[in-house]
């Protein structure tokens, strides 16, 4: 089956402090290599989370990524901050012979709108 | 520091059947797919089970599907191994593996070993 | 029979330098690793991910890739890498494990 990388949201928006979930689903598995998230585009993208066993602050991936038939590669961000905010893309990618991987897709990108967390007054009567 | 330790091996009858344990430690282990890998003697190594960290998926190649089980207590961390109808072929040293994100081997037990013969 | 082949034995000096080949996988849909098993012991994962070692690994065990084939290269060959190398993979179109059969590797002098 032909390789598809899908992110079927093109935004979400999130209160700060609160958690979201950004999904991402592939359509094969095939050729091996990893997945990784990513905030923004080009040299200066910041890696986000990657399925290669690291442990990653704040991020989790929501199904189990050790299934051997798993295409679900949504990932959770918790205690959303406004530093959070930005475009996350979903990359595929394919193992490289002794080098480093090769990106072969991405997923059309997700946009992240972070909402100042709703201040609580007490009002006292 | 990881830790894998096998029990349960032992003889058994031809068309008997064995449970064998590993109780892991020094990592998180469920959060980890696992796997048994067995050696006959004086012979290479086969996998012969894996499963899925959460414990829904199982895997099996075809000298063993339908005879062996594979299965975890995450709340005990130990993995097992059901063996049925068991053959002289399976005579072996069974070992657990760790599995890495994508599915190769990096940590290793100690092995048990599992005689069949009448 | 091993889905994946390696040769049955090696033979070098120490201080030179050792390499096993494997072979067999389809390169679009296996990661392979190397396993090294000395008598009476349990297999210890040398290269994982077709090239990557493990941090209590020596340098000199390296892991390389070139379309099917895969080598490991052991520099500066020590007494103490007398051992059985095994060759394993995953195969993500089979979700199975497949090993080669083996190379003995023997030291010389």
């Known amino acids: 089956k032909e390789l598809k990388v899908t992110q079927p949201e093109k935004s979400v928006s999130v209160a700060a402090g609160d958690s979201t979930v950004l999904n991402c689903t592939l359509t094969s598995l095939l050729p091996v290599g990893p997945i990784k998230w990513y905030r923004g585009v080009g040299q200066s993208r910041l890696l986000i989370y990657s399925f290669t066993g690291e442990h990653f602050p704040r991020v989790t991936n929501v199904s189990d990524a050790t299934k051997r038939n798993n295409m679900d590669f949504s990932i959770r961000i918790s205690n959303v901050t406004p530093e959070d905010a930005g475009t996350y893309y979903c990359v595929k990618f394919q193992k490289g012979p002794s080098e480093p991987d090769t990106e072969i897709q991405s997923g059309g990108g997700t946009e992240v709108y972070v909402l100042a967390k709703p201040s609580h007054h007490h009002h006292h009567h | 520091e990881v830790q894998l330790v096998e029990s349960g091996g032992g003889v058994v009858q031809p068309g008997g059947s064995l449970r064998l344990s590993c109780a892991a430690s020094g990592f998180t282990f469920s959060s980890n797919a696992m796997s048994w890998v067995r050696q006959a003697p004086g012979k290479g190594l086969e996998w012969v089970a894996g499963?899925?960290?959460?414990?829904?998926?199982?895997y099996y190649p075809a000298s063993v599907k339908g005879r062996f089980t594979i299965s975890r207590d995450n709340s005990k961390n130990t993995l097992y191994l059901q063996m049925n109808s068991l053959r002289a072929e399976d005579t072996a040293v069974y070992y657990c593996?760790?599995?890495?994100?994508?599915?190769?081997?990096?940590?290793w037990g100690q092995g048990t070993l599992v005689t069949v013969s009448s | 029979s091993y889905e994946l082949t390696q040769p049955p034995s090696v033979s070098v000096s120490p201080g030179q330098t050792a390499r096993i080949t494997c072979s067999g996988g389809s390169y679009s849909s296996y990661y392979y690793a190397w396993y090294q098993q000395k008598p009476g012991q349990a297999p210890v994962t040398l290269i994982y991910s077709d090239d990557k070692r493990p941090s209590n690994i020596p340098e000199r065990f390296s892991g390389s890739s070139s379309g099917t084939t895969v080598t490991l290269t052991i520099s500066g060959v020590q007494a103490e890498d007398e051992a059985d190398y095994y060759c394993?993979?995953?195969?993500?179109?089979?979700?199975?494990?497949?090993f080669g059969g083996g190379t003995k590797l023997t030291v010389l002098g």
């Open positions: 593996a760790r599995e890495t994100w994508n599915h190769l081997f990096d940590y």
């Open positions: 394993g993979g995953y195969d993500q179109s089979s979700y199975t494990n497949p």
């Open positions: 499963i899925s960290a959460g414990g829904s998926d199982t």
